[in-house]
Interface confidence: low
Amino acid sequence: DTHKSEVAHRFKDLGEEHFKGLVLVAFSQYLQQCPFEEHVKLVNEVTEFAKTCVADESAENCDKSLHTLFGDKLCTVATLRETYGEMADCCAKQEPERNECFLQHKDDNPNLPPLVRPEVDVMCTAFHDNEATFLKKYLYEVARRHPYFYAPELLFFAARYKAAFAECCQAADKAACLLPKLDELRDEGKASSAKQRLKCASLQKFGDRAFKAWAVARLSQKFPKAEFAEVSKLVTDLTKVHTECCHGDLLECADDRADLAKYMCENQDSISSKLKECCDKPLLEKSHCLAEVENDEMPADLPSLAADYVESKDVCKNYAEAKDVFLGMFLYEYARRHPDYSVMLLLRLAKAYEATLEKCCAAADPHECYAKVFDEFQPLVEEPQNLVKQNCELFEQLGEYKFQNALLVRYTKKVPQVSTPTLVEVSRNLGKVGAKCCKLPEAKRMPCAEDYLSVVLNRLCVLHEKTPVSEKVTKCCTESLVNRRPCFSALELDEAYVPKAFNAETFTFHADMCTLSEKEKQVKKQTALVELVKHKPKATKEQLKGVMDNFAAFVEKCCKADDKEACFAEEGPKFVAASQAALA
């Protein structure tokens, strides 16, 4: 349905609070270096303009598209050229090219200082002094560091952030109440950002067909009692929502997400028995709850898939008549029967089925040719099953930190050209799969592990695209979305890599090591480990373990010394020399 004024339409649909929050997120995700006050000023100007359009939709400029209005506003920023360089050239373009240009300049790894958490009393004072500004600052700081964060979900995080302060700033022990809540929000926020980044990469790099296939598989697992027509409708709507958010159309995205939640709650009977408790909640919470809802129970009477997809003589006919719908139905049928499979595995099976039909439906005897297609699935299923089993055993044997170190070594040997900070970040996150998934029952391990790994490896792909250094990484990232993880798993030691020259400076440590948090200490040690492997890619596990044990002992000794700095100065070179000898 068309509206005379798009900005008035969205303002009325969303309400002032959500409208302002979403515009702030949009601007912060586009202009990631701009100061907070500048963004607040721009948002206030847009909001005042929207109100004039609500009062009179025929008023001047009210008929302009949101991209035109927002782009014009962003292009008024005085320091655009100095701060953003070539991004300022976007302003010379017309819509829709201007918005595409802004999107291309989003920076997944902006050069922003890490957020430092002030003392609890300082935060509570700021919260009480000006709650609105305090919450806007949260939206701004998260959005500029995570330019693809799912905007309506960020409003939900902000609501939880507000609730945490409202509760804990009145508590007897403010810190004990607040800090665990903030830790939880930080960790969930990072996970949410990474998951959304994969959705946007899927849409932007592989197209909406890839995203729709992912959505069919995931929603069929969640809603196995829903009919194919129902799942198709949800997939179409969900694709629209994520296409809008990934494209920077945050107002439309939030509005459509609310409509989708409303539809799901009005049609629970034909979707899932698990939606009831979500549907009683307020909007932001409801949408979050629906997105995270557990899988419904599988219907008891599902017939064998073989009848329709292998044994039937009409397989090629049905396939030829409408390939995408036939494959969509296959994926739906397979996924609803297999909540124990990862979405990526289900997509690989659908791809294998499609390849078999492409080959066999052109053969002399198609039925004979595709009769064994389900047997061909076995190795595809066993590969992630074995991978999960082996890695969970390793995790249980080593614990999280040492498991991360094993992955650091493994991935540095595979792709040593990748920057050390990226290898450390990605391997640490890959290592978190153990604590997240290995404790789960067998039937939930693979979907948890492989779909989580897909999210983490997408982060590697996104960072690598910004600064490409490895043909192997480019190949794994771009050839096939569903085969990214198997592609990385299959990489071996890079024989063509010329080892990095030894640099004593890299292995020089100071007394500040002793005051670091446990996590920061781990990152320092893991950084050194990556550098060691880059220097000696063929070092054995035993050699590396020996050096890392010596390193830990050296740091512990110096941190206990009276003159810590003197100890590091004296013992450091000895450690370096011993390490070089051990790895010679």
């Epitope: 329709d308 008549e321 139905m329």
Partner: nanobody, 115 residues
Framework: QVQLQESGGGLVQPGGSLRLSCAAS????????MSWVRQAPGKGPEWVSA????????RYAESVKGRFTISRDNAKSTLYLQMNSLKPEDTAVYYC????????GSQGTQVTVSS
Amino acid sequence: QVQLQESGGGLVQPGGSLRLSCAASGFTFGSFGMSWVRQAPGKGPEWVSAIDSGGADTRYAESVKGRFTISRDNAKSTLYLQMNSLKPEDTAVYYCTIGRSSSRGSQGTQVTVSS
């Protein structure tokens, strides 16, 4: 989005007739083979009949051969099932589906054959 809406069911005496319709939307109906499937109380889905995209090739389950006729009108995006000489064992919910699938794809229409 794909939508299939059946109609025409009802209560009929043994030996009577009914004509079921299935209105399709959200996809290119004329490009698809279509089927009718039924599910009796307490039983699994049973494939009944199929028709190719052009309407030339029709297939029937042994239990309905000679009594049921499947047809389609691509201009109206509608699938039909003419059911004659109905028997009590034809009592079921009838569904139309895309392709030759025994999976239900819609809400269905109840057919009850009883004296």
